[in-house]
C-alpha cells in the first residue's frame, strides 16, 4: 500500500507536470507568430484512456513531437528552451508511470489539436491530484 | 530509444524480386508513415514512396508505380518493401524512414545494400 | 513533380568558414523543406525542418532560412565533423524530391 510519504511524492510530482503543461499551454495561447497556424495543424495522439499513472505512457510517447513542434516558435514566450522544457516533463513522467511496468498505450481515433492535447494532459493531472488530497 | 534496423545485404540476379524489411522499436508503429528512399553508389537520395502501418494505405513515386509494393506486419512492427524485374540500375542502398504529418524522415534505417548482377 | 535545384553542386572549405548552401524549389512549397547531412556510408541526419527549426541535439551553428522557393542553409563556423554531403527535401507534395546534394569538402 502506499505510504503518505510516497502518495505526497506523487502528489508534488503531479503538480509540477501540471504546471509545466499549464505554462506550454499558457506560452501557446500568448504567441503571435506566422509559424502558430503550422503548429496548430500537427495532430497528436490521444489516449483512448486516461484514468491511471500507468496511462502517462500515452504522454510520454508524443513528447517528442510536442517538442518539434513547440520548437517551430522559437519564442521567448516558455522560459526555457523546448527541448529542456521536455526533459524534464519526461523525467516527472518517468517517474509517475514508473519504469519497470511495459504499459502499451491505446490511443483513440481522433486526434487532437496542441492545445486540445495539453488540456486533456491537464485535465488528467488535476483529476489524479484531486483523488490524493 | 527511437530505432528502424533493416534486413542485411542482398544480391540478385536481373529480373529477379528484393524484398527489405525494416523493424521499427522505441515507438508506437502505427503512428508514424514508414517511406523508403534509395541511393545509387556516389548518387544522391530519391524518394521511392510511403506507406501508413496503420491503415496499409501506401503511394509511390511514377518512376516505381508496378515494381515497387509496401506492406507490414503490425504485431511485429515491421514493414517491408518489395522491389521487382530487378535491372543492375536498381543496385543501391535502400533506406527505410518514418515520417508524421510535416515531421518527415527524422529516424532512418541503417541502409541495405541491393546488389543486382548477372 | 517539384524540381529542388542545389548549389553549389560542390565546395571547398576552411575549418572556422562561413559557409552557405541554396535549395531554389521548381515551384512554392511554403517551407516544407528539411535540411539533412550524410556522411559516407552512413544514413542520412535531419539537421533542420519545416525550413529554419533546428533538430534537437544539432550543434546551433547549423541553421536554415527562407520561404516559398528560395532556401539557404548556413554553418557559421565550419568543424571537421561538418564535411560531408547536405541534401535538401521538399515535402509539400508527391512526390517527395531531394535537391542534388551539396559536397562540403576540406580546402
Known amino acids: 500500500a502506499p505510504t503518505s510519504s510516497s502518495t505526497k511524492k506523487t502528489q508534488l510530482q503531479l503538480e509540477h507536470l501540471l504546471l509545466d503543461l499549464q505554462m506550454i499551454l499558457n506560452g501557446i495561447n500568448n504567441y503571435k507568430n506566422p509559424k502558430l497556424t503550422r503548429m496548430l495543424t500537427f495532430k497528436f495522439y490521444m489516449p483512448k484512456k486516461a484514468t491511471e499513472l500507468k496511462h502517462l505512457q500515452c504522454l510520454e510517447e508524443e513528447l517528442k513531437p510536442l517538442e518539434e513542434v513547440l520548437n517551430l516558435a522559437q519564442s521567448k514566450n516558455f522560459h526555457l528552451r523546448p527541448r529542456d522544457l521536455i526533459s524534464n516533463i519526461n523525467v516527472i513522467v518517468l517517474e509517475l508511470k514508473g519504469s519497470e511496468t511495459t504499459f502499451m498505450c491505446e490511443y483513440a481515433d481522433e486526434t487532437a489539436t496542441i492545445v486540445e492535447f495539453l488540456n486533456r494532459w491537464i485535465t488528467f493531472c488535476q483529476s489524479i491530484i484531486s483523488t490524493l488530497t | 530509444q527511437v530505432q528502424l534496423v533493416q534486413s542485411g545485404a542482398e544480391v540478385k540476379k536481373p529480373g529477379a524480386s528484393v524484398k527489405v524489411s525494416c523493424k521499427a522499436s522505441?515507438?508506437?508503429?502505427?503512428?508514424?508513415?514508414i517511406n523508403w528512399v534509395r541511393q545509387a553508389t556516389g548518387q544522391g537520395l530519391e524518394w521511392m514512396g510511403w506507406?501508413?502501418?496503420?491503415?496499409?494505405?501506401?503511394g509511390y513515386a511514377q518512376k516505381f508505380q508496378g515494381r515497387v509494393t509496401m506492406t507490414r506486419n503490425t504485431s511485429i512492427s515491421t514493414a517491408y518493401m518489395e522491389l521487382s524485374s530487378l535491372r543492375s540500375e536498381d543496385t543501391a542502398v535502400y533506406y527505410c524512414?518514418?515520417?508524421?504529418?510535416?515531421?518527415?524522415?527524422?529516424?532512418w534505417g541503417q541502409g541495405t545494400l541491393v546488389t543486382v548482377s548477372s | 513533380d517539384i524540381q529542388m535545384t542545389q548549389s553549389p553542386s560542390s565546395l571547398s572549405a576552411s575549418v572556422g568558414d562561413r559557409v552557405t548552401i541554396t535549395c531554389r524549389a521548381s515551384?512554392?512549397?511554403?517551407?516544407?523543406l528539411g535540411w539533412y547531412q550524410q556522411k559516407p556510408g552512413k544514413a542520412p541526419k535531419r539537421l533542420i525542418y519545416?525550413?529554419?527549426s533546428l533538430q534537437s541535439g544539432v550543434p546551433s551553428r547549423f541553421s536554415g532560412s527562407g520561404s516559398g522557393t528560395e532556401f539557404t542553409l548556413t554553418i557559421s563556423s565550419l568543424q571537421p565533423e561538418d564535411f560531408a554531403t547536405y541534401y535538401c527535401?521538399?515535402?509539400?507534395?508527391?512526390?517527395?524530391?531531394f535537391g542534388q546534394g551539396t559536397k562540403v569538402e576540406i580546402k
Open positions: 522505441g515507438y508506437t508503429f502505427t503512428n508514424y508513415d
Open positions: 519545416i525550413a529554419t
Open positions: 515551384q512554392g512549397i511554403r517551407d516544407d
Open positions: 527535401l521538399q515535402h509539400i507534395s508527391y512526390p517527395w524530391t
Open positions: 506507406m501508413n502501418p496503420n491503415s496499409g494505405n501506401t
Open positions: 524512414a518514418r515520417s508524421r504529418q510535416w515531421l518527415v524522415l527524422d529516424y
